[in-house]
């Protein structure tokens, strides 16, 4: 069967099962109940589940049967739509259930909820999650599809099952080991981390489907492919970019079956014809099916083929310029895009796509102008500022980066971030400007070459997740307009943005800085971050004050949390100094 | 009516030198795929070499990269094929084609939209 082009079935839901196999369909299932209902309990999740699999094997046996030929939105809207609690829990999302399909799913899609109301995820002991790994592996691995899964209701779901593939070896192994938290730890640490940056890079993936557009997601898939496949033609990168956009087209929008079924179509296409598309991508074709996915989506650049002629010849000097837009405009940017993409590893791929903007609104112009050669002959002058910029701004902050280390380099990135949108809850302030500083240490030890395609597309990424925050509840108009008015410029629209005057600062309140014994015995991460939020709201409420008065004020209150944490009587010390730090702080900063 | 005239094939030996000319006729090379098939006595055809007529870039198949090298001249609209160190196994029938760049791959000749009669090239002592 090719690509996508499968027969015409009488029964999605059989269909499905069969190319998926049992278990796939199952945690594929529950992956999606739990991102469509994130407060349901598991068990209810499991319940469900394992009615859809009982339905879809009797498809299987009958495709003719009773509601086999229902599409997959129809039978899985339908079961959620039997929970009983579905209005005490969820409020208006109850509504979706009165709606027809499409309407219901895209209604269940719009309450998906980027920042649930769950609990924090703690971790047992490691004997205690031996001990349940080995009462019911099953149960044990369905509960973390289902954790993670509501927490993240854009994870990728072909790639969490990846990330159960390899939390269940982590346990078939740790729990046998001489030492289990010492093996185990580090892997779940390692998950975790890998997990938070895939369920964010994910997440860039659908807001750039859902708000900017196909066509948005194919440009941005046109330059990364070009660079990451620079020796394959444009017909292969435009296949595999219309490929690549059905995929996650169907993840983000709650089609989970559909889209690993054809992520896996994808890989063993991409396999087939590797000689075509890449030299770096024979030892993931080695691996089985997950793993050889999620080795394709992260392979390296292939090198780029030798003697690649000029761009200016073609797309500058040509007096046919005009004459090849006209004739296809979408076919000849997207040749421009490729074109530069492969020539350009070492650029970003929002920069890449700002160039082709820059590119398209300069042939927009010109073509219609009295000389249309005379006017776009100086157009790559115009990119050289837009290269420039994020150049600048990586060598700067990496220098900041390096002379601070990254719990520094994050706080000054609070202060700036703070003073820009100071209307931003502070935890989401926190977050974000968290992993904001996260860049340094991913990205300054790169070389020259490597550094703004890791800087930027990352902080593309981490920008998203205050855009997708900010819009669950809105508090800033310069947010908002960072966030919708261009996808690939919001990294530039955040850093253009100077202290906002218009902000009138928070009252003080004193209980905001009242600290107590617990903060001793949190994680060295905890404790940043309790500090971090604390720094947060120093700077609303002194927007004004100076980097110098805010050093001084951490400083203090780092020694005032190593003091009183050696204290004999922890929680008095924090009582009392904790009242004089309060002063002494309002003091430096004329609070 | 689109047209393609392949010219230039003939006999040569093993070691020696040709060069194939594609002129095309009702089409301009705007944004288009060129690119050069053969097909030997008995065997598929197959892709030889490509180039975008808009940024220029060129593929070849691994059998003649380093021997033959592709170019085109929109001005004339003329496709060009430079063969050096021919081999007999270059022997065959070899064939000029168009498509759209978002289509065309050299491994499948179907993604062409147009073809010439071809010219016959025969490596031989």
């Known amino acids: 069967r090719g690509v996508f082009r499968r027969d015409a079935h009488k029964s999605e839901v059989a269909h499905r099962f069969k190319d998926l196999g049992e278990e796939n369909f199952k945690a594929l299932v529950l992956i999606a109940f739990a991102q469509y209902l994130q407060q349901c309990p598991f068990e209810d999740h499991v319940k469900l589940v394992n009615e859809v699999t009982e339905f879809a094997k009797t498809c299987v046996a009958d495709e003719s049967a009773e509601n086999c030929d229902k599409s997959l939105h129809t039978l899985f809207g339908d079961k959620l739509c039997t929970v009983a609690t579905l209005r005490e829990t969820y409020g208006e999302m109850a509504d979706c259930c009165a709606k027809q399909e499409p309407e219901r799913n895209e209604c269940f899609l719009q309450h998906k909820d980027d920042n649930p109301n769950l609990p924090r995820l703690v971790r047992p002991e490691v004997d205690v999650m031996c001990t349940a790994f080995h009462d019911n592996e099953e149960t044990f691995l369905k509960k973390y599809l289902y954790e993670i899964a509501r927490r993240h209701p854009y994870f990728y779901a072909p790639e969490l099952l990846f990330f159960a593939k390899r939390y269940k070896a982590a346990f078939t192994e740790c729990c046998q080991a001489a030492d289990k938290a010492a093996c185990l730890l580090p892997k779940l640490d390692e998950l975790r981390d890998e997990g938070k940056a895939s369920s964010a890079k994910q997440r860039l993936k659908c807001a750039s489907l859902q708000k900017f557009g196909e066509r948005a997601f194919k440009a941005w898939a046109v330059a990364r492919l070009s660079q990451r496949f620079p020796k394959a033609e444009f017909a292969e990168v435009s296949k595999l970019v219309t490929d690549l956009t059905k995929v996650h087209t169907e993840c983000c929008h709650g089609d989970l079956l559909e889209c690993a079924d054809d992520r896996a179509d994808l890989a063993k296409y991409i396999c087939e014809n590797q000689d075509s598309i890449s030299s770096k991508l024979k030892e993931c074709c080695e691996k089985p099916l997950l793993e050889k996915s999620h080795c394709i989506a992260e392979v390296e650049n292939d090198e780029m083929p030798a003697d690649l002629p000029s761009l200016a010849a073609d797309f500058v000097e040509s007096k046919d310029v005009c004459k090849n837009y006209a004739e296809a405009k979408d076919v000849f940017l997207g040749m421009f895009l490729y074109e530069y993409a492969r020539r350009h590893p070492d650029y970003s791929v929002v920069l890449l796509l700002r160039l082709a903007k820059t590119y398209e609104t300069t042939l927009e112009k010109c073509c219609a102008a009295a000389d249309p050669h005379e006017c776009y002959a100086k157009v790559f002058d115009e990119f050289k500022p837009l290269v420039e910029e994020p150049q600048n701004l990586i060598k700067q902050n990496c220098e900041l980066f390096e002379q601070l280390g990254e719990y520094k380099f994050q706080n000054a990135l609070l202060v700036r971030y703070t003073k820009k949108v100071p209307q931003v809850s502070t935890p989401t302030l926190v977050e974000v400007s968290r992993n904001l500083g996260k860049v340094g240490s991913k990205c300054c030890k790169h070389p020259e070459a490597k550094r703004m395609p890791c800087a930027e597309d990352y902080l593309s990424v981490v920008l998203n997740q205050l855009c997708v925050l900010h819009e669950k509840t809105p508090v800033s108009d310069r947010v908002t307009k960072c966030c919708t008015e261009s996808l690939v410029n919001r990294r530039p629209c955040f850093s253009a943005l100077e202290v906002d005057e218009t902000y009138v600062p928070k009252e003080f309140n004193a209980e905001t800085f009242t600290f107590h014994a617990d903060i001793c015995t949190l994680s060295e991460k905890e404790r940043q971050i309790k500090k971090q939020t604390a720094l947060v709201e120093l700077v609303k409420h002194k927007p004004k004050a100076t980097k110098e008065q805010l050093k001084a004020v951490m400083d203090d209150f780092a020694a005032f949390v190593e003091k009183c944490c050696k204290a004999d009587d922890k929680e008095t010390c924090f009582a009392e100094e904790g009242k004089k730090l309060v002063a002494a702080s309002q003091a430096a900063l004329g609070l | 009516e689109v047209q393609l005239l392949e010219s230039g094939g003939g006999l040569v030996q093993p070691g020696g030198s040709l060069r194939l000319s594609c002129a095309a006729s009702?089409?301009?090379?705007?944004?288009?795929?060129m690119g050069w098939f053969r097909q030997a006595p008995g065997k598929e055809r197959e892709g030889v070499s490509s180039?975008?007529?808009?940024?220029?870039?060129?593929f070849y198949t691994n059998s003649v990269k380093g021997r033959f090298t592709i170019s085109r001249d929109n001005s004339k609209n003329t496709l060009y094929l430079q063969m050096n160190s021919l081999r007999a196994e270059d022997t065959a029938v070899y064939y000029c084609?168009?498509?759209?760049?978002?289509?065309?791959?050299?491994?499948?000749?179907?993604?062409?939209?147009?073809w010439g009669q071809g010219t016959l090239v025969t490596v031989s002592s």
């Open positions: 180039i975008y007529t808009v940024g220029g870039s060129t």
């Open positions: 009702g089409f301009t090379f705007l944004t288009s795929c």
């Open positions: 084609a168009a498509g759209s760049p978002a289509r065309c791959r050299l491994r499948d000749p179907t993604t062409f939209d147009y």
